[in-house]
């Protein structure tokens, strides 16, 4: 079953300021995606997050899985360069985590590197991962163009929230100490589309908040997703089923520091891509190992 952690997620009544350490098993769908692109000299290394949809599939943002050296072209990384960690809590201690290589890397065919429209991708794992208390899929939303309603509260987790100055090598190698060794999470409200659009249109630079995106965060700043959180799931508790649903994927934000005032985080609106996701996974919704909330 999807979207039901063995450990109950925190109540959404109280607002969290900044990020908090997650308890192990709180976000059992959370994946750390490590990319080492050896096709370039010297090798490029970076990381992002993703969400487990089934024993074999990870949902993430397309920009996490594209080569970093040609900023105006979309070159998917080779599957050989991708490693996925599941059941990971502390990046310094990968011993308890399941690591898997990729069998396939699938970027959305319309992903636009200029404005990050259609920023969604899938990784098929080489071998199905065993599910358990710390490794469980999240639910996909219903197919609905509106996406999550304004002011709804959601949670997003990642290893990049605490310290935007941490180097990639520090995150990837297990022996180093950083401020975001332990998975962090933050609670954020969905921002009305018009408000977010206006906020970005008023900035210098060519920012486009499309209908395939939604925003989350606080006007006053102070809590946000940041570098290294890309591709991570923005989850909302579905009232009817009481399951956690991936409504968004960490996509982009303004040029200011993470958590700046009136700079909302922008997320891929997953509900616009449910059909595409099922099509790639090759399983009709009814027989899906994870599932869609009904």
């Amino acid at each position: 079953e999807c979207g039901q952690p063995s450990r109950s997620l925190p109540s959404l009544v109280k607002r969290i300021i900044g990020g908090r350490n997650a308890e192990p098993g709180l976000f059992p769908w959370q994946a750390l995606i490590v990319v080492e692109d050896t096709s370039r000299v010297p090798n490029d290394k970076w990381f992002g997050s993703g969400a487990l949809l089934s024993e074999s599939w990870i949902l993430t943002a397309a920009h996490v899985l594209r080569s970093q050296r040609r900023d105006t072209t979309v070159i998917p990384v080779s599957k050989e360069h991708v490693t996925v960690y599941l059941g990971l809590h502390d990046v310094r201690d990968k011993s308890g985590a399941v690591n898997s290589s990729a069998a396939r890397v699938v970027l959305h065919p319309d992903f636009n590197i200029q404005n990050y429209n259609h920023d969604i991708a899938l990784v098929q794992l080489q071998e199905p991962v065993p599910l358990g208390p710390h490794v469980m899929p999240v639910c996909l939303p219903r197919l609905e163009p509106e996406g999550p309603s304004p002011h709804m509260l959601g949670l997003v987790a990642g290893w990049g929230i605490s310290n935007p100055n941490v180097t990639v090598d520090e995150i990837i190698s297990s022996g180093t100490r950083t401020l975001s060794d332990v998975l962090q999470y933050v609670k954020l409200p969905v921002v009305p589309h018009a408000e977010c659009k206006t906020s970005y249109e008023s900035r210098s630079g060519n920012y486009s908040v499309t209908e395939n995106m939604f925003c989350a965060g606080y006007y006053e700043g102070g809590k946000d997703t940041c570098l290294g959180d890309s591709g991570g799931a923005f989850v909302i508790l579905d009232d009817l089923s009481q399951r956690w649903v991936v409504q968004g994927l960490v996509s982009w934000g303004g040029p200011e520091e993470c958590g700046s005032k009136q700079v909302y985080g922008v997320y891929t609106k997953v509900s616009n891509y449910v059909d595409w996701v099922w099509e790639q996974m090759g399983s009709p919704q009814g027989r899906a190992p994870g599932g869609t909330v009904s």
């Epitope: 000299v41 010297p42 290394k45 040609r70 900023d71 105006t72």
Partner: antibody, heavy 113, light 112 residues
Framework: QVQLKQSGAELMKPGASVKLSCKAT????????IEWVKQRPGHGLEWIGE????????NYNEKFKGKATFTADSSSNTAYMQLSSLTTEDSAMYYC??????WGTGTTVTVSS | DIVMTQSPSSLAVSAGEKVTMSCKSS????????????LAWYQQKPGQSPKLLIY???TRESGVPDRFTGSGSGTDFTLTISSVQAEDLAVYYC????????FGGGTKLEIK
Amino acid sequence: QVQLKQSGAELMKPGASVKLSCKATGYTFTGKWIEWVKQRPGHGLEWIGEILPGTGSTNYNEKFKGKATFTADSSSNTAYMQLSSLTTEDSAMYYCLRSEDVWGTGTTVTVSS
Amino acid sequence: DIVMTQSPSSLAVSAGEKVTMSCKSSQSLLNSRTRKNYLAWYQQKPGQSPKLLIYWASTRESGVPDRFTGSGSGTDFTLTISSVQAEDLAVYYCKQSYNIPTFGGGTKLEIK
């Protein structure tokens, strides 16, 4: 060690095509991008484009689209660049390089009637 | 395209002197995901192919003498030769690979 050996100098007529080769040794040829660069006196260095031999993926500088075509033969560890519809502007030294680091020996192309 | 501007276009120094040359890009070369500046420095001696000296703006390629140092981030970069040797006579080019690669016009180093 990594080496890129390029084919010999070419003297060509305007309108003709030429195919330059770049043979790689000392590393796994299929796994690294091969870039091509043009150098003309007084014009500095210009990036033409690149190919990833293992997949055949290519990227071209807009300026050279339609002029240059990249191919690669994994069995002989050789990358090729074909230049078509040659003009005197194509007279230059052409280099291949392994993504960023090691440069080939260079091939001089002269276009003259 | 990202425009790379090198200065000076040429300079002449005596052996043993310190020399610095500049490379400026029309936009930032710092990739926020890999946290690297995609800027390389190459040395091209007369009649030879270019040779990589520095990558990621400040990492010296193996085998390159430690008198060569790269520095800078974002849009402003510098190559410093702490004590110029006669064999350093060459043209020095910077290249960005953040986007479709472009080269600077080069700095020609002459030895007095």
